[in-house]
């Protein structure tokens, strides 16, 4: 029987019985919190040969090996990952081996083991037989192998039963438990499985098989199964599904999705029925079964229950990712944050469609609305009191509502209303109202001229630059020495400049009131003698790449409440010159015949420039006598990374300081310090495992079902 | 081969309450939805309402929404219909049916709600 | 609700014709419309699904077309075993609806 879509075995050891009739979990298996330690040796599920998904493990009591569990389990075929791993043991308090000793592959992504501080048997484990790769494999902060004193099966009595590979440089016994080898096929059958008598498979076949050769006889296929064949691609009118087998266009069209809440069902595209369109395409039409390719961002269409959404931080914005039109009213509150525009844009900056209102208030954080990026329509379905669709009040760091010249905004119906926004100015509202086509709608007190804009520069003189020099890491810019009525209102400039690798940067973007912003400033002291122009040398600048630069003149904002002018200059875009590439990555060499040799590379990660050829330069060497010394006949593998030594809930293990030679005199001497690389290597360790325990715990704790 | 067998069908006073089970074999059970749908002695077909078996999300026809009930049990593989405050007009043979088309349907159980 | 009218409510056809049931919705449901069979005392069997596709084990005979809010059945030689109601229904929006039927008898 095939189970799924995922398994969740929680809380209550007795929900394993749902296992009882499974060959297949087509999906994920859980196994977790569960606290009181049971006696599990009841539990026994042979018939279970197959994960299409991923195994998590945690936080099982009593449970001290999984083989009793799964005897056959053989393929993991990591279809979907946990945070890429395929299989997941973590905190399994009383696990003392893992003992899935049927388990032969397993297809994508990596393992990780941390924290079990009990568990033995991992170091006799040979991963790269099971896996492709296990350099990403993590294993850490388990039992130390010191005090496991493993031991395979038949090693007592000098009899041993299992087979030797080299990990690490150690030629040894693999097993998963005091009694149970781990499988290895002959050499003659290659990448193929083998039989429980070493007779090989079919190529067809994963994992293992009941009879050589016979791709009706595998235990899982390397492929696609269908009508209890392995095949290597789905027959005509059938269709890839869940990564492992072929179902026809009926199942597709009746199945459901795992998290679904209505029958919007599976599509079929591209030879496979999948629960979505791809990225990039949309169903063609509700409910259908194809996909179509989307004309820009593909709409999504996000509702919000109680018909207004609020947006008070980046959590609430979070819900709308992706989101294209929304159905419904926002209300943006954001009085504080870190990052908030640059956070906002990426939660928001798809929305096109607001099928209510638009009602910013209270947001001290936001210098400007530019994180609605693609915000082309408001529709009015829903207005505030006063038939408002658009309404602005007490934002008091709001300086820009969208850079207009690169906008199109249309408001279908309602009127605009702003208020208390003090660095706003008027002439920025009147702009909207022509864009919006909202223009007459207003009435005289919607858009108050007192205190809008009341603590700006809002008449702002264009500041223009005299000179740009360049060179690869330098940029010297000079401007028109700015002269308002009264000298003494001008205090200083401010440049601002950041990468802009296109020409479509605004002086908004990524700031907020907060103290984030995307362009880099520097203030500039007015020039002593009156007749030298401004300037600035920048520096410490990429060479080969395009910069956006502005001055802002600083001037006193009020004087006897008049407005007073201001002044800035428009974005110049100015390039760096080009500098030496840094050196091309990844150089391959390989020989394909005794007199000539194919190198490859990739292109350096800093050009610097234009590449325009590359200059390749050999020279004939000695041979090393190192290569006669090694025996190439010794099944070497990519060592896994250590094991710790002890469990990681200890940031530091203090150990005797190693006696050994340091700097240029013999003699015992204290462990070298850590380098810089070292610290920053633990740190980065430290910082990715709480990262992956964060995503667990928001992974698995939910709330109860009401 | 796919099977479902409602049950729990039978004569229930007006005001009554009944449960119908559906029981469902033969396939993945928490892969397909499991929809109910009615019908009234020789008159035609009404939708009922579907629920999910593998999250226990439902959708109802506003029509049954306050009185009928829909739940899944994911280690029996069955689907049960709670009617209550019946009434003479939910007589009818009630059927389960498999699938976002509807591709595998029940035989069917009598519920009569007569006095 | 989206009304789904089916006509004929019934009609007299011989063995070897060619039958056509049409069903109109009240508005646009795409292609999501399914065609049912039911014979007296059993429970309806699925035709044909997004419109156009025919169930498996359904014979060729039987074939759907349509999108929007007209959609056919059409059975283009009638047998013994045809004889039965027929109903069209879209799934296109809650609550789902299914037409009134229409009824196959031998003339």
């Known amino acids: 029987e095939i189970c799924g879509p995922g398994i969740d075995i929680r809380n209550d050891y007795q929900q394993l019985k749902r296992l009882e009739n499974c060959t297949v979990i087509e999906g994920y298996l859980h196994i977790l919190l569960i606290s009181k330690a049971e006696d599990y040796r009841s539990y026994r599920f042979p018939k279970l040969t197959v994960i299409t998904e991923y195994l998590l493990l945690f936080r099982v009591a009593g449970l001290e090996s999984l083989g009793d569990l799964f005897p056959n389990l053989t393929v993991i075929r990591g279809w979907k990952l946990f945070y890429n791993y395929a299989l997941v043991i973590f905190e399994m308090t009383n696990l003392k081996d893992i003992g899935l000793y049927n388990l032969r592959n397993i297809t994508r992504g990596a393992i990780r083991i941390e924290k079990n501080a009990d568990l033995c048997y991992l170091s006799t484990v040979d991963w790269s037989l099971i896996l492709d790769a296990v350099s990403n494999n993590y294993i850490v902060g388990n039992k130390p192998p010191k005090e496991c004193g493993d031991l395979c099966p038949g090693t007592m009595e000098e009899k041993p039963m299992c087979e030797k590979t080299t990990i690490n440089n150690e030629y040894n016994y693999r097993c998963w438990t005091t009694n149970r080898c781990q499988k290895m096929c002959p050499s003659t059958c290659g990448k193929r499985a083998c039989t429980e008598n070493n007779e090989c498979c079919h190529p067809e076949c994963l994992g293992s098989c009941s009879a050589p050769d016979n791709d009706t006889a595998c235990v899982a296929c390397r492929h696609y199964y269908y009508a209890g064949v392995c095949v290597p691609a789905c027959p005509p009118n059938t269709y890839r599904f869940e990564g492992w087998r072929c179902v026809d266009r009926d199942f597709c069209a009746n199945i459901l999705s795992a998290e679904s809440s209505d029958s919007e069902g599976f599509v079929i595209h591209d030879g496979e029925c999948m629960q979505e369109c791809p990225s990039g395409f949309i169903r063609n039409g509700s409910q259908s079964m194809y996909c179509i390719p989307c004309e820009g961002p593909c709409p999504k269409v996000c509702e919000e229950e109680k018909k207004t959404k609020t947006i008070d931080s980046v959590t609430s914005a979070q819900m709308l990712q992706g989101c294209t039109i929304f159905k419904g009213n926002l209300l943006i509150n954001i009085r504080r944050g870190n990052n908030i525009a640059s956070e906002l844009e990426n939660f928001m900056g798809l929305i096109e469609v607001v099928t209510g209102y638009v009602k910013i208030r209270h947001s001290h954080a936001l210098v400007s609305l530019s994180f609605l990026k693609n915000l082309r329509l408001i529709l009015g379905e829903e207005q505030l009191e006063g038939n408002y669709s658009f309404y602005v009040l007490d934002n008091q760091n709001l300086q820009q509502l969208w850079d207009w010249d690169h906008r199109n905004l249309t408001i279908k119906a309602g009127k605009m209303y702003f208020a208390f926004n003090p660095k706003l100015c008027v002439s920025e509202i009147y702009r909207m109202e022509e864009v919006t086509g909202t223009k007459g709608r207003q009435s005289k007190g919607d858009i108050n001229t007192r205190n809008n804009g009341e603590r700006a520069s809002c008449e702002s003189d264009v500041l223009h630059f005299t000179s740009t020099t360049t060179s690869k890491n330098r940029i010297i810019i000079t401007w028109h020495r700015y002269r308002p009525p009264d000298y003494r209102d001008l205090i200083s400039f401010t440049v601002y400049y950041k990468e802009a690798p296109f020409k479509n940067v605004t002086e908004y973007d990524g700031q907020d009131a907060c103290g984030s912003n995307s362009w880099n400033m520097v203030d500039v002291d007015l020039p002593p003698n009156k007749d030298v122009e401004p300037g600035i040398l920048l520096h410490g600048l990429k060479p080969w790449t395009q910069y956006a630069v502005y001055v802002k003149a600083v001037t006193l904002t009020m004087v006897e409440n008049d407005h007073i002018r201001g002044a800035k200059s428009e974005i110049l875009y100015i390039r760096t010159n080009a500098s030496v590439p840094s050196i091309p990555l990844d150089v391959l060499s390989a020989s394909n015949s005794s007199s000539q040799l194919i190198v490859k590379w990739n292109p350096p990660s800093l050009p610097n420039g234009n590449l325009s050829y590359y200059i390749v330069r050999w020279q004939r060497q000695p041979q090393d006598g190192y290569l006669y010394r090694h025996n190439y006949c010794s099944k070497d593998k990519i060592p896994i990374r250590k094991y710790a030594d002890g469990t990681i809930d200890i940031e530091e293990v203090t150990e005797n300081p190693k006696t050994e030679v340091c700097g240029g005199e013999k003699g015992p001497c204290c462990a070298c310090p850590k380098t810089e690389a070292e610290k920053q290597a633990e740190k980065e360790e430290a910082e990715y495992r709480k990262v992956f325990e964060n995503f667990l715990h928001n992974s698995i704790f939910v709330p109860r079902p009401e | 081969e796919v099977q479902l067998v409602e049950s729990g069908g039978g004569l229930v006073q007006p005001g009554g309450s009944l449960r119908l089970s559906c029981a469902a074999s033969?396939?993945?059970?928490?892969?397909?939805?499991i929809h109910w749908v009615r019908q009234a002695p020789g008159k035609g077909l009404e939708w009922v309402g579907e629920?999910?078996?593998?999250?226990?999300?439902?959708n109802y026809n506003e029509n049954f929404k306050n009185r009928f009930t829909i739940s899944a049990d994911t280690s029996k593989n069955t689907a049960y219909l709670q009617m209550n405050s019946l009434r003479a007009e939910d007589t009818a043979v009630y059927y389960c049916?498999?699938?976002?088309?509807?591709?595998?349907w029940g035989q069917g159980t009598l519920v009569t709600v007569s006095s | 609700d989206i009304q789904m009218t089916q006509s004929p409510s019934s009609l007299s056809a011989s063995v070897g014709d060619r039958v056509t049931i049409t069903c109109k919705a009240s508005?646009?449901?795409?292609?999501?419309v399914a065609w049912y069979q039911q014979k007296p005392g059993k429970a309806p069997k699925l035709l044909i699904y997004?419109?156009?596709y025919r169930y498996s084990g359904v014979p060729s005979r039987f074939s759907g077309s349509g999108s929007g809010t007209d959609f056919t059945l059409t059975i283009s030689s009638l047998q013994p075993e045809d004889f039965a109601t027929y109903y069209c229904?879209?799934?296109?929006?809650?609550?789902?609806?299914f037409g009134q039927g229409t009824k196959v008898e031998i003339k």
């Open positions: 049916a498999r699938g976002g088309r509807l591709d595998q």
């Open positions: 033969g396939y993945t059970f928490t892969r397909f939805w």
């Open positions: 629920i999910n078996p593998s999250n226990g999300r439902t």
């Open positions: 508005q646009n449901v795409g292609s999501n």
């Open positions: 997004s419109a156009s």
């Open positions: 229904h879209q799934y296109n929006n809650y609550p789902y609806t």
